[in-house]
Interface confidence: medium
């Protein structure tokens, strides 16, 4: 996270840590005891194998992320249409082989339902460990900042990125740049708080660089893949 | 909700086994169409911010809130679970319906067990004047928004 | 008020086992690591070992990796250390602490009592 | 592991005077604005006592005669005035990664 600040206990309980042979690679979002919300682009093969990864809960700090504190992953679902190349469809989930234990520090996001209204420049966070700077490296400590939303239709302008939005992504940060997700945030959350409620809107997933002025952080569009995520759950159930 | 990224037209419903489109009409009718049965496993949603409790109406091929008459936990429960969600049902209330509904779901308390969708029937007046709201999680509290002052 | 509660002393041969107790009131036991420390007689004090009551995995200090066995009961709120093998040097106070890992400031707010391990034949 | 080097091994203060102890950590324990630094009092025959968490905030109930300052590899925990109940033994600790690791302790003693 560009441009953001180390987080508080607890205030983004629902944000995993994802490794792979102990180094964090991406971040999560919780949305039940046993069902991880992150981006499909981090489970491309050969990291579509679930013994790769590792999840962490409720835990800030990177060096505090040892083995046995982490739970295993029992099984990677890539979204179908996932596209590499655009990176539409950016969306995949992870189910735990043993359930979380929720506590302060450990909760799940909500899925945004459908008729829920977001004003074109809606306040949204971000959280992860990714660098804090363009090619910096990945943060020890979990930080978030505050992005707006951007409407698709500035996002894709000629000057900003041109009709590669697609409605199955959604636009967040500010134009001017300065704040923005970065490498190593992948597939955490964008979130925003409506009647005293966190809701996922976001995956973090694709941007130009990171921070920069008029190339704001790109997102999976959580609202589109509601459906496709109760139908996975409930098709393991 | 289940139409979004569908490659039927704008009428029909994409069954997720296989691809192929099928009548609206025959959606949540209580007959499978879909190879994998999924026409009949979709028939609940929860809409808005309030969690409002909407069933799907193969009659109106439209999405209906439900009506709190009669409404117990038990149903919350089933609702959840048909959502995809295990052990996890959380609470229902009644909410006032400010959406301007003049169309609702109820229960037909007397129907034997079967999936809550076939006790549900039409009607154009829900006496209690609240709908269904349900939580099938604790979602989406930080620590911040639990601590609210007194 | 938040207490972690040691039986006061131990007497064990040398080449047993002893398992070492310490349980949790006043607090919510799975929110925090439980932490054991050694401090030999006059001396300074030595991180063994911590245990997350959440997952039950364990994370050692290398030296101590094959002495000593970490382990949780979630449902009495207690947490075990068992050393085995033992020689004159395990003769020491053992300490559980407490460490908010979620706060990520790690660092220990409440000890136990302490148990005192006396090895000898 | 981070070695974490104590000084003076021991002192002895008079009442009423400043004691000022060390701790140098053999590489940085400051990270993302913080200082995993942190200091505990023990007394013969009790467990330690958390006195000042990450270098320099105070653990609620703790006199404010008790400070700490420092970062990067270099912290110090200050007495003043010292008082009769605080000869003691002082140890830092840091957790800026596990395995978190202690100072060899330092003996306050009064004249």
């Known amino acids: 996270i560009v441009g953001g600040e180390s987080a508080l206990p607890g205030a983004w309980p629902w944000q995993v840590s994802l490794h792979v042979q102990n180094v964090h690679v991406c971040g999560g979002s919780i949305i039940t005891p046993e069902w991880i919300v992150t981006a499909a682009h981090c489970v491309e093969k050969p990291l579509n194998n679930p013994w790769h990864w590792t999840a962490f809960a409720g835990i800030l700090r990177q060096s505090f992320m040892f083995y046995g504190a982490g739970y295993q992953v029992e099984k990677v679902i890539s979204h179908p249409n996932y596209d590499s190349k655009t990176k539409n469809n950016d969306i995949a989930l992870m189910k735990l082989q043993k359930p979380l234990t929720f506590n302060d520090l450990v909760k799940p996001v909500c899925l945004p339902n459908p008729g829920m209204m977001l004003q074109p420049e809606q306040l949204c966070w971000i959280s992860g460990w990714g660098a804090t700077e363009e090619k910096g490296k990945t943060s020890e400590v979990l930080n978030a900042a505050k992005v707006l939303l951007i409407e698709t239709q500035r996002c894709n302008s000629r000057y900003v990125y041109d009709n590669l939005i697609t409605p199955a992504m959604i636009c967040a940060g500010f134009l001017q740049g300065n704040v923005d997700s970065c490498q190593g945030d992948s597939g955490g959350p964008l979130v925003t708080s409506k009647n005293n409620i966190w809701w996922l809107i976001g995956d973090t997933s694709w941007g130009s660089g990171c921070a920069k002025a008029y190339r704001p952080g790109v997102y999976g569009n959580v609202m589109v893949f509601t459906d496709w995520i109760y139908r996975q759950m409930r098709a393991d159930g | 909700w289940k139409f979004m990224g569908s490659k039927c037209s704008n009428s029909g419903i994409e069954c997720d086994s296989s691809g192929t489109c099928i009548n609206p009409s025959n959606w949540c009718d209580g007959v499978s169409h879909c190879p994998g049965g999924e026409d009949e496993n979709r028939c609940v949603r929860l809409y808005g911010p309030n969690f409002i409790l909407q069933v799907y109406s193969s009659q109106r091929k439209s999405w209906h809130p439900v009506c709190q008459d009669d409404w117990s936990e038990g149903y919350g429960r089933a609702a959840c679970q048909d959502m995809g969600y295990r052990n996890s049902f959380y609470s229902s209330q009644g909410i006032v319906d400010d959406s301007g509904s003049t169309s609702f779901m109820k229960l037909n308390t007397s129907a034997g067990n079967v999936d809550i969708y076939k006790k549900l029937y039409h009607s154009d007046a829900c006496s209690s004047k609240a709908v269904v709201s349900l939580r099938c999680i604790a979602c989406g509290v930080n620590l911040n928004s639990s601590r609210q002052s007194r | 008020q938040v207490q972690l509660q040691q039986p006061g002393a131990e007497l064990a041969k040398p080449g047993a086992s002893v398992k070492l107790s310490c349980k949790a009131s006043?607090?919510?036991?799975?929110?925090?690591?439980m932490h054991w420390v050694k401090q030999r007689p006059g001396q300074g004090l030595e991180w063994i070992g911590l245990?997350?009551?959440?997952?039950?995995?364990?994370n050692y200090n290398e030296k101590f990796k094959s002495k000593a066995t970490l382990t949780v009961d979630k449902s009495s709120r207690t947490a075990y250390m068992q050393l085995s093998s033992l020689t004159s040097e395990d003769s020491a106070v053992y300490y559980c602490?407490?460490?908010?890992?979620?706060?990520?400031?790690?660092?220990?707010?409440?000890w136990g009592t302490g148990t005192t391990v006396t090895v000898s034949s | 592991d981070i070695v974490l080097t104590q000084s003076p091994a021991s002192l002895a203060v008079s009442l009423g005077q400043r004691a000022t102890i060390s701790c140098r950590a053999s590489?940085?324990?400051?990270?993302?604005?913080?200082?995993?630094m942190h200091w505990y009092q023990q007394k013969p025959g009790q467990p330690p006592k958390l006195l000042i968490y990450?270098?320099?905030n105070l653990e609620s109930g703790v006199p404010v005669r008790f400070s700490g300052s420092g970062s990067g590899t270099d912290f110090t925990l200050n007495i003043h005035p010292v008082e009769e109940e605080d000869a003691a033994t002082y140890y830092c600790?840091?957790?800026?990664?596990?395995?978190?690791?202690f100072g060899a302790g330092t003996k306050l003693e009064l004249k």
């Open positions: 602490a407490r460490w908010d890992y979620g706060s990520s400031y790690g660092y220990f707010d409440v």
């Open positions: 006043g607090y919510t036991f799975t929110s925090y690591w």
């Open positions: 245990i997350p009551p959440n997952s039950g995995s364990s």
């Open positions: 590489e940085s324990v400051s990270t993302s604005g913080y200082s995993y």
């Open positions: 990450l270098a320099s």
């Open positions: 600790q840091h957790s800026r990664e596990l395995p978190p690791t």
